[in-house]
């Protein structure tokens, strides 16, 4: 029982999770013509003390995590995208012309504690 | 009373907060000779929908915030350092020699929703 409770309480470490964004769900299908959606992914998980190397942290995140370990009023570092990539989308411009545009920072390629 | 409760519940928007890190508090005074501490700052606050321009977001953060507004299982974007600067510190190397080194990404210069 105690073991089960403990397992439930263990939050997983900062990592990338799947997320498909359907443009019709967020009301963007009126001006984004194609694609109908895309795999955006998202970052989520714990940034525990001490920060492991694979958590792709900055010196500041390491310091903040250390401070949090002695003063919980200061928040832990947060699991966020550290590497993003672009996608191309077709959208309708102000004259309702179809335009192909490259949108930067749309897809999470890597997560880290920042 | 109701007003007071409401005010308490309103979380402030993502911004930089003061944080002075005293190296003796975190046990780093053994190897960091100088300074005794530094102003690190930290980022904290809400990343609300819709993300305002001053919240210095990426396209992915805008998309994730939009998805969160229709599906709360997906977390909101997180308030993190988006601009960091370096500080110089004197530390003792393995031969107990004092070395001056520039440490990157130590001080928060700006925060944003990522």
């Amino acid at each position: 029982q105690a073991k089960h409770k403990q397992r439930k309480r263990l939050k997983s470490s900062c990592k990338r999770h799947p997320l498909y964004v359907d443009f019709s769900d967020v009301g963007w299908n009126d001006w984004i013509v194609a694609p109908p959606g895309y795999h955006a992914f998202y970052c989520h998980g714990e940034c525990p003390f001490p920060l492991a190397d694979h958590l792709n942290s900055t010196n500041h995140a390491i310091v903040q995590t250390l401070v949090n370990s002695v003063n919980s009023k200061i928040p832990k570092a947060c699991c966020v995208p550290t590497e993003l990539s672009a996608i191309s989308m077709l959208y309708l411009d102000e004259n309702e012309k179809v335009v192909l545009k490259n949108y930067q920072d749309m897809v999470v390629e890597g997560c880290g504690c920042r | 009373q109701a007003k007071h409760k409401q005010r308490k519940r309103l979380k402030s928007s993502c911004k930089r907060h003061p944080l002075y890190v005293d190296f003796s508090d975190v046990g780093w005074n053994d190897w960091i000779v100088a300074p005794p501490g530094y102003h690190a700052f930290y980022c904290h606050g809400e990343c609300p929908f819709p993300l305002a321009d001053h919240l210095n977001s990426t396209n992915h953060a805008i998309v994730q915030t939009l998805v969160n507004s229709v599906n709360s299982k997906i977390p909101k974007a997180c308030c993190v350092p988006t601009e960091l600067s370096a500080i110089s510190m004197l530390y003792l190397d393995e031969n107990e020699k004092v070395v001056l080194k520039n440490y990157q990404d130590m001080v928060v210069e700006g925060c944003g929703c990522r």
Epitope: N29, D30, W31, V33, A34, L92, E94, K97, V98 | -
Partner: antibody
Amino acid sequence: QVQLVQSGAEVKKPGSSVKVSCKASGGTFSSYAISWVRQAPGQGLEWMGRIIPILGIAQYAQKFQGRVTLTADKSTSTAYMELSSLRSEDTAVYYCARGKDIWGQGTMVTVSS
Amino acid sequence: EIVLTQSPGTLSLSPGERATLSCRASQSVSSSYLAWYQQKPGQAPRLLIYGASSRATGIPDRFSGSGSGTDFTLTISRLEPEDFAVYYCQQYGSSPCTFGQGTKLEIK
């Protein structure tokens, strides 16, 4: 100079269908949205839907869903609007528009028994 | 759907005067995808303004559009005799695209 030329006036019986054509000449056709708008006598403008010929994607106003079909033939630069189950309230001038700026001359459709 | 309400319904002015037409949306119009049209009897609508403030090709500079979000304005700085007509606003950022009911600009 781009021009949109629509098919001629039609008189239809209630319950029948009408198909109006809109032919573009002198410019780009398939990479713009082609919208269909109607105007009943003495009334305002009413958006029916739009099609993007290059992709074959169409959007319809809820009011016309299931009764209107928008198609486009890229090879002839022609868009079509077919409205079925006609009733007297469908009597109107039907316009096609390329993007926001180029409009056809309009096609009068009269529904009468 | 987004409902557009135009005011006034009728505007009576003289040539040379300034005309201000309003278009209010029931919810925010995405990316300022708002257009203004002029229509004269027996003619197709003519685009004046798109993207809330961009003048269409060949439109005189006495016509200007402004606004964002839910409040938009068409201004005709000095009315010419040929400007008396019906004016419609249209939002095209959210499906279904919708038109206002129109403002009739008549000679006083």
